[in-house]
Structures are given as structure tokens and as C-alpha cells.
Interface confidence: low
């Protein structure tokens, strides 16, 4: 339905508060270096303009597209050229090229200072002094650091952030109340950002068809009682929502997400029995709850898949008539029967089925050719099962920190050209799969583990894309979305890598390590471990373990010393010499 003024339409649909928040998120995700005050000024100008259009949709410029209005506003920023360099060239383009240009300049790893959490009293004072500014700052700081954060979900995080301060700033022990809540929001926020980044990568790098296949598989697992037509409708609507958000169309995205939640709740009887509680919540909580809802129970007595997809004489006819619909039905039927499989495994099976039909439906005896197609699935299913079993055993034996270290060594040997901070970040996240998924029973381990690994490996892919240094990473990231994890798993030690020159400075530590949090101290040690492997890629596990044990003892000893700095200087030299000898550097 066409509206005379798109900006007035969205302002009325979303309300002033959400409109302003979403415009702030959009601007901060595009111009990630701009000061907070500049963004607030731009948002206020857009909001005042939107109000004039609500009053009179025929007013001047009210008929312009949102991209035109927002792009024109962003291009008024005086420091665009000096702050963003070539991004300023986007402003010379016309829509839709201008928006595409802005999108291409989004930076997954912007050069911004680490967010430091002030003291609780300082935060509570700021919250009470100006609640609106305090919450806007939260949106701004998260959005600029996570330029693909799912905007309507960020509104939900901001609502929880506000609730935490409202409750805890009145508590007797403010810190005890607030800090765990902020930690939880931070961890959930990072996870949410990474999950959304994969959705956007899927759409932008592999296209709508890839995203829709993912959505069919996931929604069929979640809503196994829903009819195929119902799942297809949800997939179409969900694809529109994520296409909009990934494309920077945040007002449309939030509006359409609200409509989708409304539709799901109005039709929950034909979708899932698990939606009742979600549908009683307010809008932001409702949408979040639906997105996280547990899988419904599988219908009893589902017939064998073989009848329709292998034994039927009409397989090739049905496939030829509507390939994507037929493959969609296969994926739907397989996924609703297999909540115990990861989505990426289901997509691999569907791809194998498609490849077999492409080959066999052109053969002399198609049925004879594809009769054993399900047998081809067995090794595909067993590979992630075995991998998860082995890694969960290793995790249970080592614990999270040492399991991360094992992965650090493994991945540094596979792709040593990747920057040390990226290897540390990605390997630490890969290692978290243990505590996240290994506690689950067998039936839930694979969907938990492999789909989580897809999210983490996508982080590696987007960071590497910004500064490509390894052909092997590029190959695994670009060849097949669903085979990224098996591709990385299959990589062996990179024999072409020329070890890094030894630099004593890399292994020089100071007393400041003693005041770091446990997490930061781990990161320092893991950074040193990666550098060790880069210097000596052929070092054995035993050699590396010995050096890391010595290193841990050295840190512990010097942190207990009276003159810490002298201890770090003198004992550090000895440690470097001993490590060089142990590793033959």
C-alpha cells in the first residue's frame, strides 16, 4: 500500500520514541566515528521534519524516500571527508547507489576505544541526571561498534538496560544488583550481534535463496506442526524483515517485524503450541520471545520421507515443475523430523539431494540413479557427530581456558597469517562452544554446537574480509556458506608459512598484568601463545604446554614479588631464554 509520505507513515506506525531511537541507530551504524552530539542533532532535525510531514503529507520533500532523506542528512556532516575518507564519495552518487555505497563502508572492526564501564555511582548519577540522554548514548555506543546489530532487538536491549538502572540505582547495594545485569546484557548483546551478522552475510554474500533455505530449515524445526504453506509464508516475511535491517532500512524493518509478530500471535494455533506466553508480552519482549521460542513437539506418526522423495515415481516430475518449491518441501519435511540436526547439516543434506536430482533426472533410469540418495547422507551426519563427541571429551578433560588454548594452537597452525587479535578473539569464542553446548544431551548438542560455530566462523570471515591475508580463509569463507565449518576443520598445518622472526618485545611483560581481570590476563597469555606458534609452527603440544606452564608460573611469581617490575624484567629475560631453548628458536 503506497503512502504519500513514507517518513510520515513510519513515524505514525512506530511512534516518536521508537522512530527517534531507530534513526539514531541507523545513523550511528553508518557514521561510526561521529560524536554522539552530532548524531543527536541530526536525529532531532529528521524528527522535526517527520512531524511536519505527519501534519501535512503534501508538504515539501515529504514524498522523498527514506534513503534520500537520510542520505541527504548524513551528507551534511561537515567532517565527512576528513573522518571517513573515501566514504565521502558516496555523497556524489544518486539513490539507490548512494545507500549501497554507505553500506559497503560499514566497518565490522571500527577503530573505537574499548567501552569502559564507569563506577556504579557515576552511572546512576548520569542515569538520574538525564535518563533520555543516558539511554540514547547506550544505543549510540552499541550501534556504532556493531553496525549490523538487529535494530528492533537493540530497542529491546535498551529497554532492559533502562529497567536495570531503574531498579538497581535505588537498591541498597547498587553494584551487586546492577553489575550482573550489565554483564548479562553485554554477553547477550555480543551473541545477538554475531548471530545477526551471519544473517546479513548470508543475504549479502550468498543471496536471498541461501537465507530462505536457512529460514525454512530453522522454522520447520521450531514449528514442526505448521503446514508447509504456513512455514513458507513466515519465511517470506522473515526474509523481508532481515533484508531490510541488513540493508539499513531500520524503520521498515522494525515495522515489518512488529507486523510479523502480530501475525504469528493471531495464527498461533496453526503455528506452534509454545507461543502462548510470548504472545501475552508487550511488543519488544514478544518479538524477542518468538525469536527464541523452544521447538514445538513433533507431530506423532510422521510418515517416512522415502515415500515422497525417493520411492515415488513422480520425483523428477515434481522437481522439474517447481525446483525450489520441491526442495523447500524436502527441507521442511527433513527439518521438522530432525530437531537433533544442525541447520547447516540439514542444508548440506538438501544440497546433496538437489545435486543428486540434477544428475539423476537427466539419466536413462532416474529412479535407479537416485534410489540410494539417503545412503549418501550417512557420512554427512556422522562427521559433525564425531567432531562434537571428540571436542566435548577434550573440553571436559581440559576445561574452558585450556580448551581455548588447544583451539588457538590448532587454528594458528591452520591460518598463521591471520592477525593475532583476530585469532585470539575467534579461538576464544570457538572454545566457548564447550560450556555452551557440551552440557546438553546428545539430541541437542549438534544444533547447539554447529550452528554456534557457524556464527563464530562468520566473525572470522567478516574480519578477514576487511584485510585479507590468507587464501585459505578466503576459500573457506566464500565457497559455501554451509560448508565453512567442515572446510576449516579439514585444514591442516599450513606448510607454506614462513615463521615469524623472533621478537623479544612480544614476550616482554610488565607489572600491569597483575592488576588485570582474570579474563584480560587470559587474553594476554593467549596472545603470547599465538605469537609462540607463529614463531614456531612445528612446536609440539608438549613443548608449548611446557612454555605456557613456565609462563603462568612466572606471572604468578612476579605478581607476588615486592618489586614486581624488577621481577618481570629479570625473570622475563630468563623465561624468554629458556623458552627459546625449549623451542629451538
Amino acid at each position: 500500500d503506497a503512502h504519500k509520505s513514507e517518513v510520515a507513515h513510519r513515524f505514525k506506525d512506530l511512534g516518536e520514541e521508537n522512530f527517534k531511537a531507530l534513526v539514531l541507530i541507523a545513523f550511528a551504524q553508518y557514521l561510526q566515528q561521529c560524536p554522539f552530539e552530532d548524531h543527536v542533532k541530526l536525529v532531532n532535525e529528521v524528527t522535526e521534519f517527520a512531524k511536519t510531514c505527519v501534519a501535512d503529507e503534501s508538504a515539501e520533500n515529504c514524498d522523498k524516500s527514506l534513503h534520500t532523506l537520510f542520505g541527504d542528512k548524513l551528507c551534511t556532516v561537515a567532517t565527512l571527508r576528513e573522518t571517513y575518507g573515501e566514504m565521502a564519495d558516496c555523497c556524489a552518487k544518486q539513490e539507490p547507489e548512494r545507500n549501497e555505497c554507505f553500506l559497503q563502508h560499514k566497518d565490522d572492526n571500527p577503530n573505537l576505544p574499548r567501552l569502559v564501564r564507569p563506577e556504579v555511582d557515576v552511572m546512576c548519577t548520569a542515569f538520574h541526571d538525564n535518563e533520555e540522554t543516558f539511554l540514547k548514548k547506550y544505543l549510540y555506543e552499541i550501534a556504532r561498534r556493531h553496525p549490523y546489530f538487529y535494530a528492533p532487538e537493540l530497542l529491546f536491549f535498551a529497554k532492559r538496560y533502562k529497567a536495570a538502572f531503574t531498579e538497581c540505582c535505588q537498591a541498597a547495594d547498587k553494584a551487586a544488583c546492577l553489575l550482573p545485569k550489565l554483564d548479562e546484557l553485554r554477553d547477550e548483546g555480543k551473541a545477538s550481534s554475531a548471530k545477526q551478522r551471519l544473517k546479513c552475510a548470508s543475504l549479502q554474500k550468498f543471496g536471498e535463496r541461501a537465507f530462505k533455505a536457512w529460514a525454512v530449515a530453522r522454522l520447520s524445526q521450531r514449528f514442526p506442526k505448521a503446514e508447509f504453506a504456513e512455514v513458507s509464508k513466515l519465511v517470506t516475511d522473515l526474509t523481508k524483515v532481515h533484508t531490510e535491517c541488513c540493508h539499513g532500512d531500520l524503520l521498515e524493518c522494525a515495522d515489518d517485524r512488529a507486523d510479523l509478530a502480530k501475525y504469528i500471535c493471531e495464527n498461533q494455533d496453526s503455528i506452534s503450541s509454545k507461543l502462548k506466553e510470548c504472545c501475552e508480552k508487550p511488543l519488544l519482549e514478544k518479538s524477542h520471545c518468538i525469536a527464541e521460542v523452544e521447538n514445538d513437539e513433533m507431530p506423532a506418526d510422521l510418515p517416512s520421507l522415502a515415500a515422497d522423495f525417493v520411492e515415488s515415481k513422480d520425483v523428477c516430475k515434481n522437481y522439474a515443475e517447481a525446483k525450489d518449491v520441491f526442495l523447500g518441501m524436502f527441507l521442511y519435511e527433513y527439518a521438522r523430523r530432525h530437531p537433533d540436526y544442525s541447520v547447516v547439516l540439514l542444508l548440506r543434506l538438501a544440497k546433496t539431494y538437489e545435486t543428486t536430482l540434477e544428475k539423476c533426472c537427466a539419466a536413462a533410469d532416474p529412479h535407479e540413479c537416485y534410489a540410494k540418495v539417503f545412503d549418501e547422507f550417512k557420512p554427512l551426519v556422522e562427521e559433525p557427530q564425531n567432531l562434537i563427541k571428540q571436542n566435548c571429551e577434550l573440553f571436559e578433560q581440559l576445561g574452558e581456558y585450556k580448551f581455548q588454548n588447544a583451539l588457538l594452537v590448532r587454528y594458528t597452525k591452520k591460518v598463521p597469517q591471520v592477525s593475532t587479535p583476530t585469532l585470539v578473539e575467534v579461538s576464544r569464542n570457538l572454545g566457548k562452544v564447550g560450556s555452551k553446548c557440551c552440557k546438553h544431551p546428545e539430541a541437542k548438542r549438534m544444533p547447539c554446537a554447529e550452528d554456534y560455530l557457524s556464527v563464530v566462523l562468520n566473525q572470522l570471515c567478516v574480519l578477514h574480509e576487511k584485510t585479507p591475508v590468507s587464501d585459505r580463509v578466503t576459500k573457506c569463507c566464500t565457497e559455501s556458506l554451509v560448508n565453512r565449518r567442515p572446510c576449516f576443520s579439514a585444514l591442516e598445518v599450513d606448510e607454506t608459512y614462513v615463521p615469524k622472526e623472533f621478537n623479544a618485545e612480544t614476550f616482554t611483560f610488565h607489572a600491569d598484568i597483575c592488576t588485570l581481570s582474570e579474563k584480560e590476563r587470559q587474553i594476554k597469555k593467549q596472545t603470547a601463545l599465538v605469537e609462540l606458534v607463529k614463531h614456531k609452527p612445528k612446536a609440539t603440544k608438549e613443548q608449548l604446554k611446557a612454555v605456557m606452564d613456565d609462563f603462568a608460573a612466572f606471572v604468578e611469581k612476579c605478581c607476588k614479588a615486592d618489586d614486581k617490575e624488577t621481577c618481570f624484567a629479570e625473570e622475563g629475560k630468563k623465561l624468554v631464554a629458556a623458552s627459546q631453548a625449549a623451542l629451538g628458536l
Epitope: 554522539f36 573505537l112 569502559v116 564507569p118 555511582d121
Partner: nanobody, 115 residues
């Protein structure tokens, strides 16, 4: 009461140097990252540089990289900004902030670079 008091500003010729200080009180200085922010006449605040609580992780805006150095002395509860090779475009009020907020909570110190 959180207090941040900047000093060390002044008039300097292009190519000259200045060292700004920021004395902190009313909060545990050693537990927080700190930033320097500046505001040129008629412009919005611009983040300049940040340093983590321990003084090991430092970040700089592209416009001042290689010319300015941020440091801190936790024992003295003081943040520093050593500014070398100053240019006319560095003229601004400089102020320090907790974390990397660009909202000014202090008076700042005026730096003018002119011949």
C-alpha cells in the same frame, strides 16, 4: 563528587609542544579508562585519545596519530596528553572524560596554535 580539572593549555606556535594534565578526584581513578576530547570553536566535541585503566591499551584519532601521546599516573590520579608538532587545526578546548564519553563534565583547558 567526581571532579576533573585540566591544566597545561596555552598559546603555542605551529610545530610547538604542550603537555596537558587532568587531575581526578572523587572516584577510583585507577579502575577507569579515560579519554581526551576536544571542541574547536563552532564545532561539536571530537574524541582525541583514550587509555585503559592500567595504561597499557591506548587509542588515537587518525588526525593526531604519531603527534600526541596519552599516558596516566594512577598513583597521582592524573591523566596526561603530550602534544607535539602542533598545528593550527589543533586549536580547541581540551577536556578529559571518564570512559570515552564525548560529553564534557569539566571546564577544559584552552589550546591555541597560532603564529
Amino acid at each position: 563528587q567526581v571532579q576533573l580539572v585540566e591544566s597545561g593549555g596555552g598559546l603555542v606556535q605551529p610545530g610547538g609542544s604542550l603537555r596537558l594534565s587532568c587531575a581526578a578526584s572523587g572516584f577510583t581513578f585507577g579502575s577507569f579508562g579515560m579519554s581526551w576530547v576536544r571542541q574547536a570553536p563552532g564545532k561539536g566535541p571530537e574524541w582525541v585519545s583514550a587509555i585503559d585503566s592500567g595504561g597499557t591499551d591506548t587509542r588515537y584519532a587518525e588526525s593526531i596519530k604519531g603527534r600526541f601521546t596519552i599516558s596516566r599516573d594512577n598513583a597521582k590520579k592524573t591523566l596526561y596528553l603530550q602534544m607535539n608538532s602542533l598545528k593550527p587545526e589543533d586549536t580547541a578546548v581540551y577536556y578529559c572524560t571518564i570512559g570515552q564519553s564525548t560529553s564534557r563534565g569539566s571546564q577544559g583547558t584552552q589550546v591555541t596554535v597560532s603564529s
